[in-house]
């Protein structure tokens, strides 16, 4: 003979657990039905009647089989620096991600809590590490003749500044390069100003 199927609510055998998509109600001391995603428990079960489920209201959701008395509120609308990649429905929360040109500075369980604009490298600097969904751009000084530098920097008039010898880097910065991986004093070069006339050591352009 086939095993008898128990219909909810039912009292579980001592030491056994309720089946999939059922929960044990402490008050009724019965195994009762869970509500499906998109629904919540409107009336809890008793010894003689099963859980009564109802659909989630607008702007609320349940993602899992549940017996919560109220659906969860969807997150607030996406801000102007975000795009909605998943809408709020009865079965899922809204997910906001950062729009192009921005990255997630503060993430949450799903999506992003706070977006920030990606850094732009200034003249004389190029991209050392591009931005990702969760990290900002990192800039580094241009090497002489570095084509990447000119294409990644916003166009700004170049004010006169100082460069170092022997390898000039940027007219907007005064860089000197220590020896690689120093644990002792890095070597430095003296700085010279940019200009049409022969430079005098130790001055910068204003």
């Amino acid at each position: 003979l086939p095993a008898q199927v128990a219909f909810t609510p039912y009292a579980p055998e001592p030491g056994s657990t309720c089946r999939l998509r059922e929960y044990y109600d402490q008050t009724a001391q019965m195994c009762c039905s869970k509500c499906s995603p998109g629904q919540h428990a409107k009336v809890f079960c008793t010894k003689t009647s099963d859980t009564v489920c109802d659909s989630c209201e607008d702007s609320t959701y349940t993602q899992l089989w549940n017996w919560v008395p109220e659906c969860l509120s969807c997150g607030s609308r996406c801000s102007s620096d975000q795009v909605e990649t998943q809408a709020c429905t009865r079965e899922q929360n809204r997910i906001c991600t950062c729009r192009p040109g921005w990255y997630c500075a503060l993430s949450k369980q799903e999506g992003c809590r706070l977006c920030a604009p990606l850094r732009k490298c200034r003249p004389g600097f190029g991209v050392a590490r591009p931005g990702t969904e969760t990290s900002d751009v990192v800039c580094k000084p241009c090497a002489p003749g570095d084509a990447v530098c000119t294409s990644t920097s916003p166009t700004r008039s170049m004010a006169p500044g100082a460069v170092h010898l022997p390898q000039p880097v940027s007219t907007r910065s005064q860089h000197t390069q220590p020896t690689p991986e120093p644990s002792t004093a890095p070597s430095t070069s003296f700085l010279l100003p940019m200009g049409p006339s022969p430079p005098a050591e130790g001055s910068t352009g204003d």
Epitope: R119, R129, V138, C139, P141, R156, R172
Partner: antibody, heavy 125, light 107 residues
Framework: QVQLQQSGPGLVKPSQTLSLTCAIS??????????WNWIRQSPSRGLEWLGR?????????DYTVSVKSRITINPDTSKNQFSLQLNSVTPEDTAVYYC???????????????WGQGTLVTVSS | DIQMTQSPSSLSASVGDRVTITCQAS??????LNWYQQKPGKAPKLLIY???NLETGVPSRFSGSGSGTDFTFTINSLQPEDFATYFC?????????FGQGTRLEIK
């Protein structure tokens, strides 16, 4: 959470060398996104940026011209710290010296977001 | 070097007041300007970056504006903890330079 802890003497004699160290926790001196600065503050000169060191595949140093002939800023990767050496000091170098982390070197959003506690250095005989 | 001129050098105000500090650069620095707050015996603290962006965790009563050579820093509805010295700082060109500071005192 990034923390910067400064150490070094508070009194230096004229013509001697001022030496300060800044120990980093919560970041790395060889991080490819931070720069490590020394800034000083005195009633007469206000806040004065002295220089920085940072790593982007290789090490870079930038110094302000007014002290460039006397200053060295060194990273120490083994101890995760960086140091300031200022040679041939005079009473004019008396100030509170701060180390500071700079985020965003060479880009927009370039600022000092973490500072050491400050060290008052007096140059006097 | 780029000179940063702050005004006024000091000002007195009361809790609840709205105060404005200006910073003028000796040449065009785009929006490459930050504002810091410093309390006695403490290091400066970043409030505003890139002229108008509020640092995370800084109250919204602080704001900044401006571009080019003229910049403004405003505190709406002063709170007791806001009495301090405020500095602007440019990073358009090396050397990085600061304004001389504005000391905000209780009236």
């Amino acid at each position: 959470q990034v923390q910067l802890q400064q150490s070094g003497p508070g009194l230096v004699k004229p013509s001697q060398t001022l030496s300060l160290t800044c120990a980093i926790s919560g970041d790395s001196v060889s991080s490819d996104s931070s720069a490590w600065n020394w800034i000083r503050q005195s009633p007469s000169r206000g806040l004065e940026w002295l220089g920085r060191t940072y790593y982007r595949s290789k090490w870079y140093n930038d110094y302000t011209v007014s002290v460039k002939s006397r200053i060295t800023i060194n990273p120490d990767t083994s101890k995760n710290q960086f140091s300031l050496q200022l040679n041939s000091v005079t009473p004019e170098d008396t100030a509170v010296y701060y180390c500071a982390r700079e985020d965003g070197v060479g880009g927009t959003k370039d600022y000092f977001d973490y500072w050491g506690q400050g060290t008052l250095v007096t140059v006097s005989s | 070097d780029i000179q940063m001129t702050q005004s006024p050098s000091s000002l007195s105000a009361s809790v609840g007041d709205r105060v404005t500090i200006t910073c003028q650069a000796s040449q065009d620095i785009s929006n490459y300007l930050n504002w810091y707050q410093q309390k006695p015996g403490k290091a400066p603290k970043l409030l505003i970056y890139d002229a108008s962006n509020l640092e995370t965790g800084v109250p919204s009563r602080f704001s900044g504006s401006g571009s080019g050579t003229d910049f403004t820093f405003t505190i709406n509805s002063l709170q007791p903890e806001d009495f301090a010295t405020y500095f602007c700082q440019q990073y358009d060109n090396l050397p990085i330079t600061f304004g001389q500071g504005t000391r905000l005192e209780i009236k």
